[in-house]
């Protein structure tokens, strides 16, 4: 049996149920390199408070759908009195990068996950040329996810203080430059990851090659090497390679550009202090607050929810969009969707789609961005299900008693964009973490 | 690709201000920076100021901070340029450039262009 997903056949994957300390790894296509689970084990779970092994999912016991991965075993679980075999159940859908799998729950015999992927969805639109893993648990199983930061088209300028050259680069993935014809960022070679300009010339000296890395506590690695045999002849006869390093700031702060550290023989070390180094709680809530010792702000938007079923409305030209958010109201024009962004088309009122669900809520503050994510939608043809970015924007004297008003700012791909001025955007800092 | 179109440049006297808009249109949020370059007759193509569409963050060139400030709205598609305390050697036809590159303020890394404003600031 073909292997139903091959972009991500090439790694062992990882997911960590952090209520029971469990730690799996998941390799989807073959098995995982873990004697304990034996030579054939695709799902391979490592409790750590026990420290014992188990397989959960026999890499030869598998069935695959489109969207469901199902891996049995052999071994026997007692579930309400029937006599089962454990398994794992991998959800898939559609996502703009590889992800990650996720964790979602288990029962004494099913071990449930859910990935969004690029490997999942109906069109190849959002399919790199070369993408790897970008995402990291540390020791303490707490998640590094430097998804958020990967460019779906264009890149990042790394400061350099050479005035002659230009390094590009993008995260985990090569740059996409299709969107851009004018720069000089088009002559990029396809595959790059890390591409040089040096006057009308680029050069690829960087292709992902190897997953994220944990080096210690708040410090990951990525490295990118060219795969292309022939040198470069302004490399001495080296290979070129680039090396990034992310640091996890010890304080709340502004995002900064990355840094070229080193150069040397077309090695290149860059150096980037980015918030999104630092693990995923320290970032992110499912509720509409960020508050605590964890994260050393203060960020509350539940005022912003609308009570009575009336709803926040953004025109964006062809759509009207209603929003509801940091509640469970229902947007009365949204068919009982459970949409907290719902959209509708102005000419045909009956068309209504929801634009991310009030259950599938994110909020993030890094690098002194504020974003609320609604995710979940319902599908569009690539498969991908619609979602809604709001970014916020502290505004003292915001009208509508300080909640100001969401204001659409456009759509790729079946995402929308808002930015919302409102004085509940006013972030109160803490100190250290 | 995005199309941009400035408007707003004018004759002022030294000391005054003007406010330059860019309208954009297309698809305008595969681009992530944009920015207000300026060039006057014999010169290079000079940075101004950036900011990108999905924050507030904003950038400028030493010369403009303190007087100039970029902003934008989101709702019209358009960025601003806002210049007071105006002086002579402020004048150069203005540029409004839209960029997929983060983090940049070189001319060659914007791959849209509108066609200028001329602001011409006398003594």
């Known amino acids: 049996q073909a292997a139903p997903f091959p972009e991500l056949c090439s790694y062992t994957w990882e997911a960590v149920d952090t209520k029971n300390n469990v730690l799996y790894k998941i390799n989807i296509c073959g098995s995982v390199d873990i004697v304990q689970c034996g030579p054939s084990s695709a799902v391979c779970m490592h409790d750590l408070d026990t420290r014992t092994y188990h397989s959960v999912g026999d890499s030869v016991l598998r069935s695959a759908t489109r969207s469901l991965l199902e891996f049995n075993t052999t071994v026997s679980c007692d579930q309400q009195g029937t006599n089962h075999r454990v398994q794992s159940s991998i959800a898939f859908l559609c996502g703009k990068t590889l992800g990650t799998p996720e964790f979602v729950t288990a029962t004494e015999c099913v071990h449930y996950f859910e990935w969004r992927t690029t490997a999942a969805c109906k069109k190849d639109i959002f399919k790199a040329n070369k993408e790897v893993p970008c995402y990291v648990f540390d020791e303490e199983l707490r998640k590094h996810d430097l998804n958020p930061l990967i460019k779906l088209s264009g890149a990042y300028l790394v400061d350099d203080s050479d005035p002659d050259t230009s390094l590009f680069i993008n995260v985990c993935r090569d740059i996409d430059t299709l969107r851009d014809p004018g720069s000089q960022l088009r002559a990029c070679p396809p595959g790059t990851a890390a591409c040089l300009v040096r006057g009308h010339q680029a050069f690829d000296v960087g292709q992902p090659r190897d997953g994220l890395k944990v080096v210690r506590k708040d410090r990951l690695v990525l490295s990118y090497v060219r795969e292309e045999a022939g040198k470069l002849d302004f490399c001495d006869g080296h290979s070129p390679a680039v090396t990034i390093t992310f640091v996890c700031p010890s304080e709340r702060r502004e995002g900064t550009i990355p840094k070229l550290t080193a150069k040397s023989n077309c090695r290149y070390e860059i150096e980037w202090i980015t918030e999104y180094a630092c693990h995923r709680d320290y970032l992110e809530s499912k509720t509409c607050s960020l508050s605590g010792e964890q994260q050393d702000v203060s960020i509350d938007l539940t005022p912003l929810a609308q009570s009575g079923g009336s709803s926040y409305i953004s025109d964006g030209k062809e759509y009207l969009f209603y929003l509801n958010v940091c509640g469970e109201t229902e947007i009365q024009f949204c068919n009982k969707k459970q949409a907290a962004v719902c959209q509708v088309k102005k000419s045909d009122t009956s068309q209504v789609k929801a634009a991310g669900r009030y259950h599938n809520q994110t909020l993030r503050y890094s690098d002194g961005d504020l974003t609320l994510i609604y995710f979940g939608g319902d599908e569009c043809s690539s498969g991908f299900q619609r979602m809604s970015v709001i970014n916020f924007e502290c505004n003292k004297t915001a009208g509508n008693d300080g909640k100001g008003t969401p204001v659409f700012t456009g759509e790729v791909d079946c995402t929308y964009f808002f930015t919302w001025d409102t004085e509940y955007a006013c972030v109160h800092h803490h100190h250290h973490h | 690709q995005v199309q941009l179109q400035e408007s707003g440049g004018g004759l002022v006297q030294a000391g005054g201000s003007l406010r330059l808009s860019c309208e954009a249109s297309?698809?305008?949020?595969?681009?992530?920076?944009w920015g207000w370059f300026r060039q006057a007759p014999g010169k290079e193509r000079e940075f101004v100021a950036a900011i990108r569409w999905s924050s507030s963050k904003t950038s400028y060139a030493d010369s403009v901070k303190g007087r100039f400030t970029i902003s934008r709205d989101n709702a019209k598609n358009t960025i601003y340029l806002q210049m007071n305390s105006l002086k002579p050697e402020d004048t150069a036809v203005y540029y409004c450039?839209?960029?997929?590159?983060?983090?940049?303020?070189?001319?060659?890394?914007?791959?849209?262009w509108g066609q200028g404003t001329q602001v011409t600031v006398s003594s």
């Open positions: 450039a839209a960029s997929i590159v983060d983090f940049t303020t070189n001319p060659s890394h914007f791959g849209s």
């Open positions: 297309g698809r305008t949020f595969n681009t992530y920076n």
